[in-house]
């Protein structure tokens, strides 16, 4: 909260509400729809963000082919429940009693059931694959300077840990960005990858989460990188349970 | 000096509507939380909703959604607390305080008894 | 909902001793920073008053005999030594999550 001192506002999530009546008198930044207050030094989770949101109102040779178990949010919007640290209940239901297991990334990974339906454990989505396409430019971008530009971004707009963006891969127009991190390598304080990549999805829609910030402008060796597709894929750590019908259909 | 200073006291019939309002003075209102709060006689404290006057964003207890409305008036310096279709069992002072949670400030109560 | 309990419901302490008033959360309502814990004191016909913020914060012009403690779920309010004006119902209340629930309150009385 202490990100939030200056002028009592929340820099990493624009999505708040903050006032001046935290611990000793400090600016205190809290949630839409949640009322969770939230540290502005680092991303808020996604959890949190849905829930704000919902208040507020080509097969290629070195692209990596998604598993057969790869999640893609198909779903769209949904109010979730979030637990006491702000992250996704293993267990969602609707208004009207319909109930599904999601992962940690917030995505449906069963059927829809119904309240008896058992969630055990929260799944942890280990792997993201984002897929994007960019709008034509005049020649291709070189593949090592855009691969230290999306590690930069990472780094410094989302503060994610190097080490959690395991490669990305370019074949014009198609980029790929590959994020690991098991649940044995985040340790305290580190950024999850599913609220970076949540926020970077964001920021590519043009929406962005950060407060005041300009929107994404990326560029690599001064030419701009204008995205005009983004697919995200989501690998957990036990493959969904899904029933035959879906899988075929 | 902070002040928060309510309407008098109401007595409705049942199914009815009352509004309660909380005049806010000495500090800049569009600041900060204002929270209501409702106390039955010789009940606990029991927390109905909040109200951020800055952007009019509004929180409730499941308990109360539908039924209360709150909404300030930042030009008045006012925050009100509007509770519909009354039952005897919202008889209770109620209360507005400034803050999320640990309000440092309360208006003094205003009663609400419904009788029929 | 955070359910907030405490106990005892009702205490007689001598003057000049030591009250001790415990409030169990049903779940953490604790960072690594901070606990979203708030001690009241409401003396009939009165509305409540903030005595402690965030779980061990003294509020401005409360006696400092008045001292709160703990972290996660389980929290204390002591007055190191009861005054008479201290008689009230003394409330908990959290801010983690809406709804920001109170726990019931304990009666404080003189033995």
């Known amino acids: 909260h202490t990100a939030a001192q200056d002028n009592c506002t929340c820099p990493t999530n624009k999505m708040t509400v903050c006032s001046p009546d935290g611990p000793g008198g400090r600016c205190q930044c809290r949630a839409l729809g949640s009322g969770m207050a939230v540290d502005c030094s680092t991303l808020t989770s996604k959890c949190l963000l849905l829930k704000a949101r919902m208040s507020a109102p080509k097969n290629a040779r070195t692209l990596v082919r998604p598993s057969e178990h790869a999640l893609v949010d198909n779903d769209g919007l949904y109010d979730p429940d979030c637990d006491p640290e702000g992250r996704f209940k293993a267990r969602q239901c609707n208004q009207t009693s319909v109930c599904w297991c999601v992962n940690s990334v917030g995505v449906r990974r069963t059927d829809k059931g119904d309240l008896s339906l058992r969630c055990d454990e929260l799944v942890r989505t280990h792997h993201i694959l984002i897929d994007l396409r960019h709008r034509p430019t005049a020649g291709a971008f070189n593949h090592s300077d855009l691969d230290a530009e999306l590690r930069r971004l990472f780094r410094e707009r989302y503060r994610l840990h190097p080490k959690f963006v395991a490669a990305v891969h370019y074949e014009q127009p198609t980029i790929q960005i590959e994020l690991r991190q098991n649940t044995s390598q985040k340790a305290a304080g580190d950024v999850d990858i599913g609220d970076a990549a949540y926020y970077f999805e964001r920021d590519i829609k043009g929406e962005s989460l950060f407060q005041g910030r300009g929107g994404l402008d990326l560029r690599v060796r001064g030419e701009p990188l204008q995205v005009e597709r983004t697919l995200i894929y989501y690998l957990d750590e036990i493959p969904p349970k899904f029933s035959m019908k879906r899988l075929t259909a | 000096q902070v002040q928060l200073v309510q309407s008098g006291a109401e007595v409705k019939k049942p199914g009815a509507s009352v509004k309660v309002s909380c005049k806010a003075s000495?500090?800049?209102?569009?600041?900060?939380?204002i929270g209501w709060v409702r106390q039955a006689p010789g009940q606990g404290l029991e927390w109905i909703g909040d109200?951020?006057?800055?952007?009019?964003?509004?929180n409730y207890n499941e308990k109360f959604k539908g039924r209360a409305t709150l909404t300030a008036d930042t030009s008045a310096s006012t925050a009100y607390m509007e509770l519909s279709s009354l039952r005897s069992e919202d008889t209770a002072v109620y209360y507005c305080?400034?803050?999320?949670?640990?309000?440092?400030?309360w208006g003094q109560g205003t009663l609400v008894t419904v009788s029929s | 909902d955070i359910v907030m309990t405490q106990s005892p419901d009702s205490l007689a302490v001598s003057l000049g001793e030591r009250a001790t008033i415990n409030c169990r959360a049903s779940q953490s309502v604790s960072t690594s920073s901070y606990s979203y814990m708030h001690w009241y004191q409401q003396k009939p016909g009165q509305p409540p008053k903030l005595l402690i913020k965030?779980?061990?914060n003294l509020e401005s012009g409360v006696p400092d005999r008045f001292s709160g403690s703990g972290s996660g779920t389980d929290f204390t309010l002591t007055i190191s030594s009861l005054q008479a004006e201290d008689v009230a119902v003394y409330y908990c209340q959290h801010s983690w999550e809406i709804p920001y629930t109170f726990g019931q309150g304990t009666k404080l009385e003189i033995k």
């Open positions: 965030y779980a061990s």
């Open positions: 109200i951020y006057p800055g952007g009019g964003y509004t």
């Open positions: 000495g500090y800049t209102f569009t600041n900060y939380w």
């Open positions: 305080a400034r803050g999320t949670g640990g309000g440092d400030y």
